[in-house]
Interface confidence: low
C-alpha cells in the first residue's frame, strides 16, 4: 500500500498515481460489428470535440506536449480500431479536471469497445501544473484526431 505523506497538490492524487485496473464492466469478448463501432464513434466525436474546445478556451496559450503519445489505434487490425484499453486510463485521469458528465459518457462509450479482461495500462502524468495542462490538451487533441481517423476508415469500408 502506498500511503500519502504530507499535503500535496491536487493532481498528484490521481493524475500522477494511476493504477492498473481490470475494468469491472463486462466488455465484449469479440469485436463489435462495424455498424456498432460507427455508432459509438459518432457518439464520441461531439463529446471529444466539445471537451477539447472547452479546454482550449479555458487554457489559452498552453502548447501541445511533444512528449505525449496516445497509442489510440491498434496496429494489429485493418481497418485500425480504437485501442480502448490504452485510452481509458487517460480519461479516468483527466476526469477530475473536466465536466464529469461528458467524461462519464466518453468512458461509457470506450468501455463498450473494450475487450473483456484487457488490462488498462498504468500511466504517469506530469506533476508540474503547466506540464499537466499541456499533457491534458495533447490527450484531448490526439483523441479527437484518432476518432476522425477511425471514422474515415469506417466510412470508406463496408457499412
Amino acid at each position: 500500500m502506498l500511503s500519502h505523506t504530507g499535503p500535496s497538490r491536487f493532481a498528484l492524487f490521481l493524475l500522477c498515481s494511476m493504477e492498473t485496473l481490470l475494468s469491472s464492466h463486462m466488455a465484449p469478448t469479440h469485436q463489435l460489428p462495424p455498424s456498432d463501432v460507427r455508432k459509438i464513434i459518432l457518439e464520441l466525436q461531439p463529446l471529444s470535440r466539445g471537451l477539447l474546445e472547452d479546454y482550449q478556451k479555458k487554457e489559452t496559450g498552453v502548447p501541445e506536449s511533444n512528449r505525449t503519445l496516445l497509442l489510440c489505434l491498434t496496429s494489429d487490425s485493418q481497418p485500425p480500431r480504437l485501442n480502448s484499453s490504452a485510452i481509458l486510463p487517460y480519461f479516468r485521469a483527466i476526469r477530475p479536471l473536466s465536466d464529469k458528465n461528458i467524461i462519464d459518457k466518453i468512458i461509457e462509450q470506450l468501455d463498450k469497445l473494450k475487450f473483456q479482461h484487457e488490462p488498462e495500462t498504468e500511466i504517469s502524468v506530469p506533476a508540474d501544473t503547466f506540464e499537466c495542462k499541456s499533457f491534458i490538451l495533447t490527450i484531448l487533441q490526439q483523441f479527437s484526431a484518432c476518432l476522425e481517423s477511425v471514422f474515415k476508415s469506417l466510412n470508406s469500408g463496408p457499412q
Partner: antibody, heavy 118, light 111 residues
Framework: EVQLVESGGDLVKPGGSLKLSCAAS????????MSWVRQTPDKRLEWVAT????????YYPDNIKGRFTISRDNAKNTLYLQMSSLKSEDTAMYYC???????????WGQGTSVTVSS | DILLTQSPASLAVSLGQRAIISCKAS??????????MHWYQQKPGQQPKLLIY???NLEAGVPTRFSGSGSRTDFTLNIHPVEEEDAATYFC?????????FGGGTKLEIK
C-alpha cells in the same frame, strides 16, 4: 440507485479498536475512489481517509495516519475503516462516501456512530 | 492545511428571497482553471448531500435555484428563490490539497 450502508459503530474505550464496514450497491464499486468522512458532536465535518478505486493508493490527514487504515474488497463491494488507538476526539458519526473523479464526494451513506469514552 | 471560513455562521431569509453564503480559503483552491470547491447541504438527522461540485457545476437532480460561483480563494453559494425545504446547514469543501478540509457550516433558516 446508489446505496452506501455503514455498520460497526459502537461505544469503545480510549486506546481501543473498532472496524467499520460500508456495503455499496447500485454502482460499479470498483470504478470509484471511496472515502470516510466524520462529523463531530459539534457538527464539524472532517475528512478521515480516501482509497483509490483499485485499492493501491491510500490517503490520510496527519492526525489519523498510523492509527486508522482504509481498505476495500472490490469482490464484496465493501469499504472498511480499521481504527486503533482510539481517542475521545475520534467520537463522531462516520460516513462512507463515494468519490467522483477523486476530488468530489457525490454520495454519502447514512453514517455509523462511534463513541470513545471510558 | 487550507482553512475554509464560511460566513455568515447563520442567516434567516424570507421565503422567495435570495440567500448568499460565502466561503473563503486561506490559499487558492483552483487548479488548471477549475475551482476545486464543493458545496453540500445537510438537513437535521440526515447525511450531507452534494449540491455544487467544482465551484459552479450543479449536481444532477439539484434544483436550478442553487448556483455556485467563484475562483481561487473566494466562493459563493446562491439560493434564489429560497424555499421552505432549503432550511439546512450548508458546508463548503476543498479538494485542492491534502488534507481535504470543510468550512464550519452555515445554518439557513427560512422566515
Amino acid at each position: 440507485e446508489v446505496q452506501l450502508v455503514e455498520s460497526g459503530g459502537d461505544l469503545v474505550k480510549p486506546g481501543g479498536s473498532l472496524k467499520l464496514s460500508c456495503a455499496a450497491s447500485g454502482f460499479s464499486f470498483s470504478n470509484y475512489g471511496m472515502s470516510w468522512v466524520r462529523q463531530t458532536p459539534d457538527k464539524r465535518l472532517e475528512w478521515v481517509a480516501t482509497i483509490s478505486y483499485g485499492g493501491s493508493y491510500t490517503y490520510y490527514p496527519d492526525n489519523i495516519k498510523g492509527r486508522f487504515t482504509i481498505s476495500r474488497d472490490n469482490a464484496k463491494n465493501t469499504l472498511y475503516l480499521q481504527m486503533s488507538s482510539l481517542k475521545s476526539e475520534d467520537t463522531a458519526m462516520y460516513y462512507c462516501v463515494r468519490g467522483y473523479g477523486y476530488d468530489t464526494m457525490d454520495y454519502w451513506g447514512q453514517g455509523t456512530s462511534v463513541t470513545v469514552s471510558s | 492545511d487550507i482553512l475554509l471560513t464560511q460566513s455568515p455562521a447563520s442567516l434567516a431569509v424570507s421565503l422567495g428571497q435570495r440567500a448568499i453564503i460565502s466561503c473563503k480559503a486561506s490559499q487558492s483552491v483552483s487548479f488548471a482553471g477549475t475551482g476545486l470547491m464543493h458545496w453540500y447541504q445537510q438537513k437535521p438527522g440526515q447525511q450531507p448531500k452534494l449540491l455544487i461540485y467544482r465551484a459552479s457545476n450543479l449536481e444532477a437532480g439539484v434544483p436550478t435555484r442553487f448556483s455556485g460561483s467563484g475562483s481561487r480563494t473566494d466562493f459563493t453559494l446562491n439560493i434564489h428563490p429560497v424555499e421552505e425545504e432549503d432550511a439546512a446547514t450548508y458546508f463548503c469543501q476543498q479538494s485542492r490539497e491534502y488534507p481535504w478540509t470543510f468550512g464550519g457550516g452555515t445554518k439557513l433558516e427560512i422566515k
